[in-house]
């Protein structure tokens, strides 16, 4: 029960910060910026990795998309390819972790192929949530380091001036949502590996030890195992396999530990 | 790069007309916020007028009824009417916008080489 309970919890939190991560890539708010020196209006300026907005005091709002990709800084496309890469990721380890869990029946499937598959979305999950953090990393430390650099002139030339303007940035809610959103996946795909282990049919050393009290005759199947008693040939207590003997366990199949729904 | 080029400066009589203009060219993403601002022989730069890109606009009190400044984004281009001229108005005049570059998420503050508008008779 604990196996599925941790298998269920894994998922539905995979699925909250899979869908964070989305949210978080779809936001504008990564940074935000007040521009301090403007005679004019409070302009309050805010860019996510798709478009950069501008929200006046006066109400005007406008955003402008990032239609050209040769003006952006190749940080800006590492982090909108490890976001789109954790979407992606998390998209598929969704659809392989609906397949995988236990309270979910398709055909004949076994309980190995469950813990793979769930083994496999955890993994994918734990990637996915390691790429949306480290995206959302490398943008708010693109951020710091932007605004640490020098104020000073950027170039003059024809009686003209271009500087930077002093301006009060502050991470935007997209990074918040993101570096929480990573988290909750990857605690997702964790979860699902956990589980994983106890989805995974345990090798027993032994098989089961069937008694039957029908009548008089009482029948007692050891299994396998011969009782070792040092001079034997068995000495290791190897498993021995009893070609076509087989056990009662092994003629009439009952519902094992793992078989609930 | 961004670049600001004014035209429309002269000389003109006190009591006369002129009407100023600003074209940004260059790697323009967005300019949020333009102004005039003019500096006098032996004097401090000072702010004219602006406008921002919503429309907002703001002037110096010494101009307040006798300017006019307008711009049209689409071609980021800004303009300023200037009527009933003083001689107090003879200066050089600058345009100046606030552009966004989301290359480096920051500001750039871009000034214009100036114009100069003479006043007298």
């Known amino acids: 029960m604990a196996v599925t309970a941790c298998q269920g919890l894994g998922f539905v939190v995979s699925l909250i910060g899979i869908a964070g991560i989305i949210a978080a890539t779809c936001m504008d708010q990564w940074s935000t910026q007040d521009l301090y020196n403007n005679p004019v209006t409070a302009v309050f300026n805010y860019q996510g990795l798709w478009r950069s907005c501008v929200r006046e005091s006066s109400g005007f709002t406008e955003c402008r998309g990032y239609f050209t990709l040769l003006g952006l800084p190749a940080m800006l496309q590492a982090v909108r390819a490890l976001m789109i890469v954790g979407i992606v990721l998390g998209a598929i380890g969704l659809l392989v972790s609906i397949f995988a869990l236990k309270c979910i029946r398709i055909g004949s499937m076994e309980d190995s192929a469950k813990a793979n598959m769930t083994l496999t979305s955890g993994i994918m999950f734990i990637v996915s949530g390691l790429c949306a953090i480290a995206g959302v990393s490398v943008f708010a430390n693109m951020l710091v380091t932007n605004f640490w650099m020098s104020t000073a002139n950027m170039y003059t030339g024809m009686g003209g001036m271009v500087q930077t303007v002093q301006t009060r940035y502050t991470f935007g809610a997209a990074l918040f949502v993101g570096w929480v959103a990573g988290g909750l996946t990857l605690i997702g795909g964790v979860m699902m590996c956990i589980a994983c282990r106890g989805l995974a049919p345990e090798e027993t050393n032994y098989k089961a030890v069937s008694y039957h009290a029908s009548g008089h005759s009482v029948a007692y199947k050891p299994g396998g195992f011969k009782a070792s008693t040092g001079f034997g040939s068995n000495t290791k207590n190897k498993k021995i396999y009893d070609g076509g003997a087989r056990t009662e366990d092994e003629v009439q199949s009952y519902p094992s530990k793992h078989d609930y729904v | 790069e961004v670049q600001l080029q004014e035209s429309g400066g002269g000389l003109v009589q006190p009591g006369g007309s002129l009407r100023l203009s600003c074209a940004a060219s260059?790697?323009?993403?967005?300019?949020?916020?333009m102004g005039w601002y003019r500096q006098a022989p032996g004097k401090q730069r000072e702010f004219v007028a602006g406008?921002?890109?919503?429309?907002?606009?703001n002037y110096a009190h010494s101009v307040k009824e006798r300017f006019t400044i307008s711009r049209d984004n689409a071609k980021n281009t800004m303009y300023l009417q200037m009527n009933s001229l003083k001689s107090e108005d003879t200066a050089g005049y600058y345009c100046?916008?606030?552009?966004?570059?989301?290359?480096?998420?920051?500001?750039?503050?871009?000034w214009g080489q100036g114009t100069l508008v003479t006043v007298s008779a």
């Open positions: 100046n916008a606030q552009a966004w570059d989301p290359g480096t998420i920051r500001y750039l503050e871009v």
């Open positions: 260059g790697n323009i993403f967005r300019i949020d916020t």
């Open positions: 406008i921002s890109r919503g429309g907002s606009t």
